[in-house]
């Protein structure tokens, strides 16, 4: 699987999950998030050669087409597969609130 | 929606579904498919600027991050959203068989 366990331990050029730290205030302008100050959102990048973690029949077909037609511009793209939530603390005035934000952290990638 | 109705009628540079005709024999080397000879598989391509048909919270966050940090290499990618099956005819010896291949045709795209 193209997950953090594999991708963070290997120098992988092809489609893999990459570490990306986002500071809420500096990078997003989100002043309302109190804690954490930032988090590892991660992202997916790298080429999708034929049969690499293909998501659907279409991505397999497109990968094969691309292999047999190297000049073609159509190829699968490396995108998130598994995402996890992030728990944050914010304030409503002086009252603290805890919220779970869904689909915030990329754990693995696929070729789609 | 970034679907064929919209994308095939507009000269859209950003993420959209593009027409792609695949000839089973010539492009894939699939001699076993008798009919059709080929089909419009289509594909997704184009930049994913901030807020364009974002798939998840993560892709919206990544798009916002990319907007506020233009030098960043992390950005969402244009990939298939809705896929449709394709019905094909093939032969097992002299016996014709009809099969529905799932997820063969891209109908719309998203930024993921």
């Amino acid at each position: 699987a193209l997950d953090t366990n594999y991708c963070f331990r290997n120098l992988e050029e092809n489609c893999c999950v990459r570490p990306l730290y986002i500071d809420f205030r500096q990078d997003l302008g989100w002043k309302w998030v109190h804690e954490p100050k930032g988090y590892y959102a991660n992202f997916c990048s790298g080429p999708c050669p034929y049969l690499r973690s293909a998501d659907t029949t279409h991505s397999t077909v497109l990968g094969l087409y691309n292999t047999l037609n190297p000049e073609a511009s159509a190829s699968p793209c490396c995108v998130p597969q598994d995402l996890e939530p992030l728990t944050i603390l914010y304030y409503v005035g002086r009252t603290p609130k805890v919220e779970q934000l869904s689909n915030m952290v990329v754990k693995s990638c696929k070729c789609s | 929606a970034l679907d064929t109705n919209y994308c095939f009628r507009n000269l859209e540079e950003n993420c959209c579904v593009r027409p792609l005709y695949i000839d089973f024999r010539q492009d894939l080397g699939w001699k076993w498919v008798h009919e059709p000879k080929g089909y419009y598989a289509n594909f997704c391509s184009g930049p994913c600027p901030y807020l364009r048909s974002a798939d998840t919270t993560h892709s919206t966050v990544l798009g916002l991050y990319n907007t506020l940090n233009p030098e960043a290499s992390a950005s969402p990618c244009c990939v298939p959203q809705d896929l449709e099956p394709l019905t094909i005819l093939y032969y097992v010896g002299r016996t014709p068989k009809v099969e529905q291949l799932s997820n063969m045709v891209v109908k719309s795209c998203k930024c993921s």
């Epitope: 997003l28 302008g29 989100w30 002043k31 309302w32 914010y90 304030y91 409503v92 005035g93 002086r94 009252t95 919220e99 934000l101 | 901030y50 807020l51 919270t57 919206t60 966050v61 916002l64 907007t67 506020l68």
Partner: antibody, heavy 120, light 108 residues
Framework: QVQLVQSGAEVKKPGSSVKVSCKAS????????ISWVRQAPGQGLEWMGG????????NYAQRFKGRVTITADESTSTTYMELSSLRSEDTAVYYC?????????????WGQGTLVTVSS | ETVLTQSPGTLSLSPGERATLSCRAS???????LAWYQQKPGQAPRLLIY???SRAPGIPDRFSGSGSGTDFTLTISRLEPEDFAVYYC?????????FGQGTRLEIK
Amino acid sequence: QVQLVQSGAEVKKPGSSVKVSCKASGNTFSSNVISWVRQAPGQGLEWMGGVIPIVDIANYAQRFKGRVTITADESTSTTYMELSSLRSEDTAVYYCASTLGLVLDAMDYWGQGTLVTVSS
Amino acid sequence: ETVLTQSPGTLSLSPGERATLSCRASQSLGSSYLAWYQQKPGQAPRLLIYGASSRAPGIPDRFSGSGSGTDFTLTISRLEPEDFAVYYCQQYADSPITFGQGTRLEIK
């Protein structure tokens, strides 16, 4: 700089609903927290609630809970305020405003206002 | 909810004079949860002061805010003709956000 453009005036019957839109220009829609404030003719300002785009966390004034829904559509950089079970005392100018960044905060940019008239 | 009481209800002054507007909260707001707005007829409110004493961008330095706890003041050091309007205080320490009933500043 944020610009907030609201939908046009509405005339509604008692018991019906109204949905007012507020479109933000500029690239930082999802960095803003949007509040809704109303002002009855000749009266003061009254906060109804607010929303954090992207994550769709909404907070409402208790007296409007169950009657008001505030949502955000990131794809169009638009926030909506829907008020149901309208009565004559809901006749007011409804404003959207972006806060300085917190859920409850001062409001630095305001829409032009939308007059909602409730009359039978 | 926190009730904000503004005084006076109406203030009649001449251009060039000093205006002092008061806002009293029914419970302590600390030192940084109060804002002041100016509103003219047919217009949306305009933020003047936030955090009790910080001027919003583009606001002339004749406007200043002070106070903490329950007592806050907006001072306009030297009134200009365009300053005659209605002024509201707003608290954002607790939900719901509340506004004072307003002080009308009129030309004497």
